[in-house]
Interface confidence: low
């Protein structure tokens, strides 16, 4: 029959070649010639001349070593022909398979394979994988199977099998418990890889573990008892820096220190917090501390980490024990700022208040006071008593020195310590208002129409406070009467000048009486240019026309 | 910043040779393998060579294998193609490549390719 | 040599619209030890190649969701569950399991 079954060829072979495979023969041949020939990729197409056949006896034939790896099979065609050329079967398919042979040592991908795994962690958890591959086959023999195995570990602590890899994955997992990265940070494993499913060639590579930092040890305090003396009355004093250890990685979260007070401070005098490059906790004055209240503080400080602990640790409690030193502290006026009211114009030497100083030291000291900010010089002190008197005339209208009707003065309290300390206290005068000025009309200059004049309207103005300003009251005088008109406003605050009888063109001067609410009267004379016009008239009287 | 700068293309007559150099900068490179890709004019992507992290393991398609070399220099943070015997259908752009990290050959990191023209 | 063929060549989209590109290879791209390293590149026009799956179906860091891999074995797909016009450009398909390592033929994806 005109068929071939497949031809088995293992790769490599040693010959001697040509190497007789298998006869192509034709049931045909009775009576006549059978001439065979076969084409193909590794016939008479690339790559040509692997394979040939005997022309007349049909028998196939192989020339050199067949590499698997590089073709793993040949698809040939067998033809018959007949002397005179016709072709006397239907081309045959002829397929070479190319069996494998172990002719390849499993390649690693990496030199270095690298991975990391917390320290800590249970076994069976996974660190990495390694790969190696082979270019053998794996299908149909165990020549490319790779079997993966650990061949050595470096360093064997807390012992020699932290590890184990599995055979057919190349996955690199923990088998023991005791990864500490403090006693090993890393470890070196020569991996091997062996073909044949671990029967055959080996390969190695190297596999490093780093094992990472877990928060497994806590900061403990170095020392754990500190004695600080600190000032009374500072605030933000470094009273004592802290010291801790931690094994754990340093400047990672798992060593960073966290401090809280967590006894001692009922007061809330004090704040803890952590140094970012020591590390130490930085233990200061949040308020100032009283030596006459409480000269010592005992405060208890706890250490944890940025990070939460891994496992169950204690936490670390340090001691700190804080002497208050006494200073001699400033007198402090009671209250630091006294609003007072003095009413304006009052006599040279009247007394407007009393403003004390207390001493908060326990030794009696003697207080002596002057005044260090008085702009107007309007007030004077008494240095024994703190009595403070008018020394001037206080003027509420005052507006260089006087801002919404106060007026600030600064006083100073000096004790008889060594060295003596001075406090300050502020006194704020509110100055009551008092009748002292009469209302004053703007402007003071008016310009009218003689023929159906308009009236002027002129602002009135009071420095003082009601009741002793507006309304106002206007009155003609000196008989200023007898040609003007003066009116005050319904509201009571602009009086209007107008003409009752012609005036030729002329400058003429207006007595104009004004009183405000509280009867104070102020005579202001108004200068009125009457213009030859009608109705209203602006700047200068106009130029009479000439006719030409 | 993770980056490769590859240098070294040109004009070269069939027969002839040139090296191809791939500037790493921005990672560990000794940790890494490599690779080296092209692609024709108006055609896909081929890959050439690749290179194990160490230097230990190299690997070709039968297309350049004898006459294409990749090597590495994890000093200078750089990786090579010596190219022998160059023929027309070597033409193409070459590109350099970083494996992603560990045992997988697949490429993250791609340089920004440099041009190899055969021709006489 | 493992052939990776990938189907259409040429794939008009519309933005908006879902897009799928099929690749399959001449035999199992599983490896030994249990991966199968296949994975999808984008060449943008004038840019290199940039990765953008890989183990089939894993988004490479900054690849936007609306991309996505599946398959096994010989098949493989690669979605994109809404097109826009920063995806086109020349798919490829990549194994990675066995050498030589092969890349499909390219899928070029353009707008409309």
């Known amino acids: 029959e005109w068929v071939m079954p497949p031809i088995f060829v293992p790769e490599n072979g040693k010959g001697p070649f040509p190497q007789r495979l298998n006869q192509l023969k034709s049931n045909k041949d009775r009576g006549t010639k059978i001439f065979y020939s076969i084409t193909g990729p590794g016939a008479d197409s690339p790559p040509e001349g692997v394979f040939t056949i005997e022309k007349e006896s049909g028998w196939l034939l192989l020339h050199m070593p067949l590499d698997r790896e590089k073709i793993v099979k040949y698809e040939l065609y067998g033809h018959a022909v007949s002397e005179n050329g016709a072709s006397v079967e239907e081309p045959m398919n002829i397929s070479i398979i190319v069996t494998d042979q172990n002719d390849n040592k499993p390649k690693f991908t990496q030199d270095t394979f690298r991975g990391s795994v917390l320290e800590g962690v249970m076994p069976g958890t996974s660190v990495m994988q390694v790969t190696a591959t082979d270019e053998d086959d794996a299908v149909n023999t165990y020549n490319g199977v790779v079997a993966y195995s650990i061949h050595s570990q470096e360093p064997k602590e807390p012992h020699d099998l932290m590890f184990t890899i599995h055979k057919s994955t190349g996955t690199i997992s923990v088998i023991s418990s005791g990864l500490d990265r403090e006693k090993v940070p890393e470890y070196r494993l020569t991996v091997q890889a062996t073909d044949m499913d671990g029967e055959g060639s080996t390969t190695t590579a190297e596999a490093v573990v780093q094992i990472l930092d877990a928060n497994d040890n806590a900061p403990e305090f170095e020392p754990q008892k500190y004695e600080a003396w600190v000032p009374e009355n500072e605030v933000g004093h470094e009273v004592q820096r802290l010291t801790v250890t931690d094994l754990d990685v340093p400047n990672s979260p798992a060593w960073r220190a966290t401090y809280h007070i967590v006894g001692g401070d009922d007061g809330d005098h004090f704040t803890i917090t952590t140094h970012p490059e020591t590390n130490q906790g930085v233990l200061t004055t949040k308020k100032g501390l009283d030596f006459e209240a409480q000269d010592q503080h005992t405060l208890y400080v706890e250490v944890t980490n940025e990070a939460p602990f891994a496992v169950k640790l204690p936490t670390a409690t340090a001691t700190v024990v804080v002497h208050v030193k006494d200073v001699n502290e400033a007198p402090v006026f009671v209250p630091p700022s006294k609003v007072i009211e003095a009413q304006e114009g009052i006599s040279i030497g009247e007394l407007v208040c009393i403003y004390t100083a207390q001493d908060p030291d326990k030794e009696d000291q003697k207080i002596s006071y002057t005044i260090s900010r008085d702009p107007a010089n309007w007030l004077a002190v008494d240095p024994d008593s703190g009595q403070i008197t008018a020394a001037g005339i206080l003027d509420r209208e005052d507006e260089q020195f006087v801002k919404n009707n106060v007026y600030e003065v600064m006083v100073l309290a000096t004790d008889s310590g060594n060295p003596p300390t001075t406090g300050t206290g502020t006194l704020l005068l509110t100055l009551t208002d008092i009748n002292d000025h009469g209302p004053i009309p703007e402007p003071r200059q008016i310009i009218i129409c003689n023929q159906s004049p308009v009236p002027q309207v002129l602002n009135i103005t009071d420095k003082d406070l009601s009741p002793n300003s507006s309304p106002f009251q206007a009155q003609l005088t000196h008989d200023s009467d007898i040609y003007w008109m003066a009116e005050v406003s319904e509201k009571g605050d602009t009086v209007a000048l107008s003409l009752k009888k012609f005036l030729k063109q002329d400058t003429y001067d207006l007595h104009l009486s004004l009183s405000d609410h509280g009867n104070r009267e102020q005579l202001t004379m108004i200068r009125a240019t009457v213009c030859d016009c009608h109705g209203q008239v602006f700047n200068d009287c106009p130029r009479p026309w000439k006719g030409g | 910043e993770v980056q490769l700068v590859q240098s070294g293309g040109g004009l070269v007559k069939p027969g002839g040779s040139l090296r191809l150099s791939c500037a790493a900068s921005?990672?560990?490179?000794?940790?890494?393998?490599m690779s080296w890709v092209r692609q024709a004019p108006g055609k896909g992507l081929e890959w050439v060579a690749t290179?194990?992290?160490?230097?230990?393991?190299?690997y070709y398609p039968d297309s350049v294998k004898g006459r294409f070399t990749i090597s590495r220099d994890n000093a200078k943070n750089s990786l090579y193609l010596q190219m022998n015997s160059l023929r027309a259908e070597d033409t193409a752009v070459y590109y350099c490549a970083r494996h992603y990290y560990g045992s997988d050959w697949y490429f993250d990191v791609w340089g920004q390719g440099t041009t190899v023209t055969v021709s006489s | 040599d493992i052939v990776m063929t990938q189907s259409p060549s040429s794939l008009p989209v519309t933005p908006g619209e879902p897009a799928s590109i099929s690749c399959r290879s001449s035999q199992s791209i599983v490896q030994s030890n249990g991966n199968t390293y296949l994975e999808w590149y984008l060449q943008k026009p004038g840019q290199s190649p940039q990765l953008l799956l890989y183990?089939?179906?894993n988004q490479f860091s900054g690849v936007p969701d609306r991309i996505s891999g599946s398959g096994s074995g010989t098949d493989f797909t690669l979605k994109i569950s809404r097109v826009e016009a920063e995806d086109v450009g020349v798919y490829y398909c990549f194994q990675g399991s066995h050498v030589p390592l092969t890349f499909g033929q390219g899928t070029k994806v353009e707008i409309k």
């Open positions: 921005g990672f560990t490179f000794s940790t890494y393998g």
């Open positions: 290179i194990s992290d160490g230097g230990s393991y190299t």
């Open positions: 183990k089939v179906s």
